[in-house]
């Protein structure tokens, strides 16, 4: 079973331990997700005026990142466990090629950028065993993701750090609605 | 004890920029998960929330008034800014920030400062 | 411009209870639970009574206590005190990453 990072394999196998889907457990994993995702944006600052950049300015981009929305089942006025999970999951799939894009984007924070794709890895393993429609959860083609790396990687210096800069701005909004999703399941 | 206190011009000239710094003591203004907001109240009226700057510096803002709306920090000084553009006396009103501990799944402010009254008069 | 639906005033006796309602929508009370109440005496900055929906503040009395339910959300005070004459406000988050505050009540403790 994946382990949540902080957490001792042999805590995880006792008889009388919360299951590792406890939604304490699984608000703990995203919360150290985004604290790896603030360092990263920390770095990207540092060298970069990204930052800076009004929201606008940065959603006039072509990057099809994983967003919630009404439909998704994940608000309480329309909250449905299944639907909600199997977009989180879904959403985190997506994101999934563009956390392997972040890898070569840093250099002081490189081991940090790992640990954020490995841990949102375990996510996606906890919150698999803890969906029942896993026939509904669409995982990405390879190919697909493929030819997006290279076109991301492609990219000029400019835009290779709007790139990173919209990538970990739109991952921790994105694992913040799920965080406060899971909250309610 | 954590103790914001704002500061600013307390008279702004219709169609001026407003400009305001609130200046926070007793921790950092990036401590995860930390968020920091501005609220107004005019005279005689309610709260209104105007839009807030987040532990990693990221902005959202009051739809109603985005376009005039500018919240920055300097970590530096542990301070954070609210400047509201093209002001009219409508924007006349006493000026607080606060507060959130949580802005993933807190959403309420649980210190304020004591508010800075702003008139906008020629 | 947003705002939740408080009644503007109501009033309670000495020792009595007396409840405020502050009505949202699904895209902030009915789709969170993420509703705060505050009070505000006359010249001062409001203080943090209630959050997520039904937890007290720090230091705060048991008198104070709240609830929701659907788009609807309520603050209760018991055995109302003379010092509870203040504003009172509702706020909750709302879709995406945005507050909202009610616009507020004015309690009168009647003796």
């Known amino acids: 079973a994946p382990v949540l990072p902080g957490e001792d394999s042999k805590d995880v196998a006792a008889p009388h331990s919360q299951p590792l889907t406890s939604s304490e457990r699984i608000d703990k994993h995203i919360r150290y997700i985004l604290d790896g995702i603030s360092a990263l944006r920390k770095e990207t600052c540092n060298r970069s005026n990204m930052c800076e950049s009004s929201k606008e300015a940065l959603a006039e981009n072509n990057l099809n990142l994983p967003k919630m929305a009404e439909k998704d089942g994940c608000f309480q006025s329309g909250f449905n466990e299944d639907t909600c999970l199997v977009k989180i999951i879904t959403g985190l799939l997506e994101f999934e090629v563009y956390l392997e894009y972040l890898q070569n984007r840093f250099e002081s924070s490189e081991e940090q950028a790992r640990a954020v794709q490995m841990s949102t890895k375990v996510l996606i393993q906890f919150l698999q065993k803890k969906a029942k429609n896993l026939d509904a959860i669409t995982t990405p083609e390879p190919t697909t993701n493929a030819s997006l790396l290279t076109k991301l990687q492609a990219q000029n210096q400019w835009l290779q750090d709007m790139t990173t800069h919209l990538i970990l701005r739109s991952f921790k909004e994105f694992l913040q609605s799920s965080l406060r999703a899971l909250r309610q399941m | 004890e954590v103790q914001l206190q704002e500061s600013g011009p307390g008279l702004v000239k219709p169609s001026q920029t407003l400009s305001l710094t609130c200046t926070v003591s007793?921790?950092?203004?990036?401590?995860?998960?930390?968020?920091w907001s501005w609220i107004r109240q005019p005279p005689g009226k309610g709260l209104e929330w105007m839009g807030v700057?987040?532990?990693?510096?990221?902005?959202y803002y009051s739809p109603s008034l985005k376009s005039r709306t500018s919240i920055s920090w300097d970590t530096s000084k542990n301070q954070f800014s609210l400047q509201l553009s093209s002001v009219t006396p409508e924007d006349t009103a006493v000026y607080y920030c606060?507060?959130?501990?949580?802005?993933?799944?807190?959403?309420?402010?649980?210190?304020w400062g004591q508010g800075t009254q702003v008139t906008v008069s020629s | 411009n947003f705002m939740l639906t408080q009644p503007p005033s109501v009033s309670g006796t000495l020792g009595k209870t007396v409840t405020i309602s502050c009505a949202g929508t699904?895209?902030?009370?009915?789709?969170?639970?993420?509703v705060s109440w505050y009070q505000q005496l006359p010249g001062t900055a409001p203080k943090l009574l209630i959050h997520?929906?039904?937890t007290r503040a720090s230091g705060i009395p048991d008198r104070f206590s709240g609830s929701k339910s659907g788009n609807t959300a309520s603050l209760t005070i018991s055995g109302l005190r003379s010092e509870d004459e203040a504003n009172y406000y509702c706020?909750?988050?709302?879709?995406?990453?945005?507050?909202?505050f009610g616009g507020g009540t004015q309690l009168t403790v009647l003796g």
């Open positions: 606060a507060r959130d501990p949580d802005v993933v799944t807190g959403f309420h402010y649980d210190y």
């Open positions: 007793g921790g950092s203004i990036t401590t995860r998960y930390y968020a």
């Open positions: 700057i987040d532990y990693d510096g990221d902005t």
């Open positions: 699904s895209s902030d009370i009915g789709g969170y639970n993420y």
């Open positions: 997520r929906v039904s």
């Open positions: 706020a909750s988050y709302r879709n995406f990453n945005n507050a909202v």
